[in-house]
Amino acid sequence: IIDGYKCKEGSHPWQVALLKGNQLHCGGVLVDKYWVLTAAHCKMGQYQVQLGSDKIGDQSAQKIKATKSFRHPGYSTKTHVNDIMLVRLDEPVKMSSKVEAVQLPEHCEPPGTSCTVSGWGTTTSPDVTFPSDLMCSDVKLISSRECKKVYKDLLGKTMLCAGIPDSKTNTCNGDSGGPLVCNDTLQGLVSWGTYPCGQPNDPGVYTQVCKYKRWVMETMKTHR
């Protein structure tokens, strides 16, 4: 997260880190005791999932292996549409005040809505500085019409933009797949943006979760 702040401890109990060994690979969001939602571009063969701590590499955090993941069947490595994936944990999470599932959206929030994005991604760009603490940034949803002025045809119908006018605050390397939460519901998953990160008036681009609720529910049901 560029130009963000340290999240209030315990305020993001649904935030997970997808690790490759002990190294951060992507963010993710707990949606069920067996399931984590993340970006399709975060796919790996297997994952170590850290839950229940704001500190990356915390020894006291829950760590659960995941060997199965399900990309949206329409994910395109060319256009990056449908950049969403479910990761099935090998064993269920122990729910607590520190580990909770996020609320999936009932509706799509409108432009102008205030949201928070979080992650352990680099706080500087292009040179990287990875924080140990979970970082947050407060951003507002931007209309597709406004966002297309920046990204033109790169912006797909199920992509969502968020940012703050004239501000550098944005997501960056390592934040991928992490949550954009608006009014206590999951509205976005970090997908992409311009580089170096934090260029004012270049919004962050997210997968618009409200458009995928049916796919999420059906996929979890199918692979129970």
């Epitope: 571009h41 760009s125 033109k152 790169l154 960056c172 390397n173 991928s176 997908s191 992409w192 580089y195």
Partner: antibody, heavy 122, light 108 residues
Amino acid sequence: QVQLVQSGAEVKKPGASVKVSCKASGYTFTSEGIHWVRQAPGQGLEWMGSISASSGDTNYAQELQGRVTMTTDTSTSTAYMELRSLRSDDTAVYYCARAAGYGARHWYFDLWGQGTMVTVSS
Amino acid sequence: DIQMTQSPSSLSASVGDRVTITCRASQSISSYLNWYQQKPGKAPKLLIYGASSLQSGVPSRFSGSGSGTDFTLTISSLQPEDFATYYCDQFYSTPPITFGGGTKVEIK
């Protein structure tokens, strides 16, 4: 230091295969994609394809589809490009390059290997 | 696929000259165009990304401009070490990534 180091020059006969390696160091290999670009003698640059080091997702240039395979070995931070059924017009310098960006999209090549000369001759 | 056309294909110039190279895309690529410098026997080196942003460590005599389909690389005062071949590429509609044909800058 941040670098990509490629394997040495190769001389191959028409119809044979070649496998070029590209070892990354100084950065997190699995967080970036590796692209391959070639340059025939006295000619311009030609994009061949790319691979995501973490997912193994590949995209190949249409004209090379079926002849080229890109792979990675994350344990050694090495990318490989294999080209089969070699022809004389495959004679070129082959470069690996890192694409800079984050998340699903990348925007430019900020790091290149030194190049590997592949000569196809009978 | 988007075609990138560079012009001129070669030019002769003297040290201290102002040099301009153009790159035209077959359709709009917004500002997702980059410029590279390549010297004989060496790998290309990034000069400009996003049409106008100077890569770290590149001298300020290099500048880029343009958006949509027409782009320009300018060297404000040519130095001896600038004699090389210059390429543009587009990262807008990818894959494939497409390069311009190159412009060779030679000593007059």
